[in-house]
Each structure stands twice: as C-alpha cells, then as structure tokens.
C-alpha cells in the first residue's frame, strides 16, 4: 500500500503497452459505486481515450469511463452506455466524479464540482467483483487486448472508489479537498502495479 | 450466435422518408446499444446515432439531428432507423452495430439506400 497524496501517474506519450493496475479488496458484487479522479490531457479535441477501465471475465466494459472526441464523457455500465455532452473543450486539469446505483438505475456525473442532469442506466443490473481496474488503456478484454489510439496521455490522480452514491454535500467535499474514506479504492493508501512507460510525479492541480 | 440482420434495398424518390430495420438474436436485446452507421461510396463511416434498448433513450450526432430517428420494438428485438427529406447525398451504405462509442462488436451486413428520381 502506498499513500500517494498529492502525486499522480504521469502517461507521457501515447503506447499499448503502458498503464496501471489498481487492486481493490472487493468481495461481492456492486449494486451501486462512486468514482472520483483527477486527469489533465491535451487529447481532448485530438481523439478519444479511456480516463477509468473496470473489467470482468464477464464484460469487459463492466465500468467504462471513456472521453470521445466531438461528443465528451462516455460513461458505461454493464457494456451499456450513456453519453454526457461536453460542448466546449479547453485544456485544464478535470476532476469527475461518476455514481450509479442498480434499485433505480441513476447515474450522475459531476465535472469540477457541478452535476450534470442524471440519467439512467442498467436497472437491477450488479457490477461484478472480481476485477481488473486499469488506468491508462482501455480494456477489450480482461486485463487486456489495448489500442494505443484509446490510451491516455497526460497526467492522472486523486482516483478513489466507493461501494456506494455519495451525496452531493460528500461529492462537495471531495472536489474542495476535505476529509473522505474511500473503501474500494483508496488513493492515500494504494495498491497497484505499473507496467510500461509510466511515472510517479507530484500533482498539478491544487 | 450473435447476429443482425438488416432489412433490404430501399430505392426512393428525393423529398420521401425512409425506414430501415435491424433485426438482433442470439443475445439478451436489452443489454447493450444500438449504433447505425453510414457508409457512402468511398467515404469513410459517419456515426448517426444509438438507442438504449434497455430504457429507448437516444443520442444523435450533430450531422444527423433532424434527419434519423431511432426507435425499437422490444419484443421483436429489432431496431428501426427512419430517414426523413432524403436527397442524393443520402444514398450510400446504413449498417447498425451492437456496443458502445468506444467499441462495435457486432455489425449488420448493411442495407444500401439510393436516392434517385
């Protein structure tokens, strides 16, 4: 475990070969999760890349959170996806925050602290537990099968998980820089495994 | 098996609608979305658009709002793509695909739609 507080993983170009494996100490499957990170890339009006790849022997696209260009934030559950617009793009470190919850299906997205309208996802559906998480690439199979026109290049930190929606005031917090306890992915207290060309620097944004 | 199977040949006149189906077996309809792409002669693929056949929600791209509308027939597991104010730049190649932006997995053998008078 390694706190990684105010650090980030650093993609400095783009490749099929470099990511980051997290480990997260899930036991049963989810019927509901919070993602909060921290990324800063220039690719936005250039392609697409993956921001968060969650992957089951059952559906490789079992959490997508993917950037497309000309359209914005791809967010997929269950290998099913909704879309939320991103009209103007400018360069500048993002934080994302993205719940969803299987009783109703919502999902939320939050950009820089401000909620996008909710929508709705995968009723009923549960996430499976176990998982390759992987920051960097996008997964087209377990732990794999990467194509360097979806990897990410530029910076990626502050990634956290929890096992349930936080709230808005939680979310809030989160985006100001409070206190939080993460019980899926933990950021100050990370297990993970680097492969390829990535680096461990100090964080850019505040 | 996975398959789609889309509807045939449509010839029509400049001005008419159109309506294009795609046909899915051989996996659960509601679990994932369908993509319709199009293919004009020598060009490369234009996204159009998807629906949710879980919930019937859509997502046009920019170029096809006002043109394609998207609708589905649950218990037929086939997906319906309408075309309206058609003109010869219309004519080309329409294919649906199952998946998601980032990826297609499975794709219809096309319906070719020509817009002539």
């Known amino acids: 475990q390694t706190d990684m507080s105010r650090k980030a993983f650093v993609f400095p170009k783009e490749s099929d070969t470099s990511y980051v494996s997290l480990k997260a100490p899930l036991t049963k499957p989810l019927k509901a999760f919070t993602v909060c990170l921290h990324f800063y890339t220039e690719l936005s009006s250039t392609r697409g890349y993956s921001i968060f790849s969650y992957a089951t022997k059952r559906q490789d696209n079992e959490i997508l959170i993917f950037w497309s260009k000309d359209i914005g934030y791809s967010f997929t559950v269950g290998g099913s996806e909704i879309l939320f617009e991103v009209p103007e793009v400018t360069v500048a470190p993002v934080h994302i925050c993205t719940s969803w919850e299987s009783a109703s299906g919502i999902v939320e997205f939050w950009v820089d602290g401000k909620p996008r309208v909710r929508k709705s996802l995968k009723k009923g559906y549960t996430v499976g537990a176990e998982a390759s998480i992987i920051l960097g690439q996008e997964q087209d199979s377990f732990g794999g099968n990467f194509e360097g026109s979806q990897s990410l290049v530029g910076d990626i930190g502050n990634v956290n998980m929890w096992d349930f929606v936080l709230s808005p005031d939680e979310i809030n917090t989160i985006y100001l820089g409070g206190p939080f306890s993460p019980n899926v992915l933990n950021w100050r207290a990370l297990k993970y495994e680097v492969q390829g060309e990535v680096f461990t620097k100090p964080q850019l944004w505040p | 098996e996975v398959q789609l199977q889309q509807s045939g040949p449509e010839l029509v006149k400049p001005g008419a609608s159109v309506r294009m189906s795609c046909k899915a077996s051989g996996y659960t309809f509601t679990d994932y979305n369908i993509h319709w792409v199009k293919q004009s002669h020598g060009e490369s693929l234009e996204w159009i658009g998807f629906?949710?056949?879980?919930?019937?929600?859509?997502y046009y791209y920019k170029n096809f709002r006002g043109k394609a509308t998207l609708t589905l027939n649950k218990s037929s597991s086939t997906a319906y793509m309408d075309l309206r104010s058609l003109t010869s730049e219309d004519s080309g190649v329409y294919y649906c695909?199952?998946?998601?932006?980032?990826?297609?997995?499975?794709w219809g053998q096309g319906t070719i739609l020509t817009v002539s008078s």
């Open positions: 695909a199952r998946g998601t932006t980032v990826e297609k997995d499975y």
């Open positions: 629906i949710n056949p879980d919930n019937g929600d859509t």
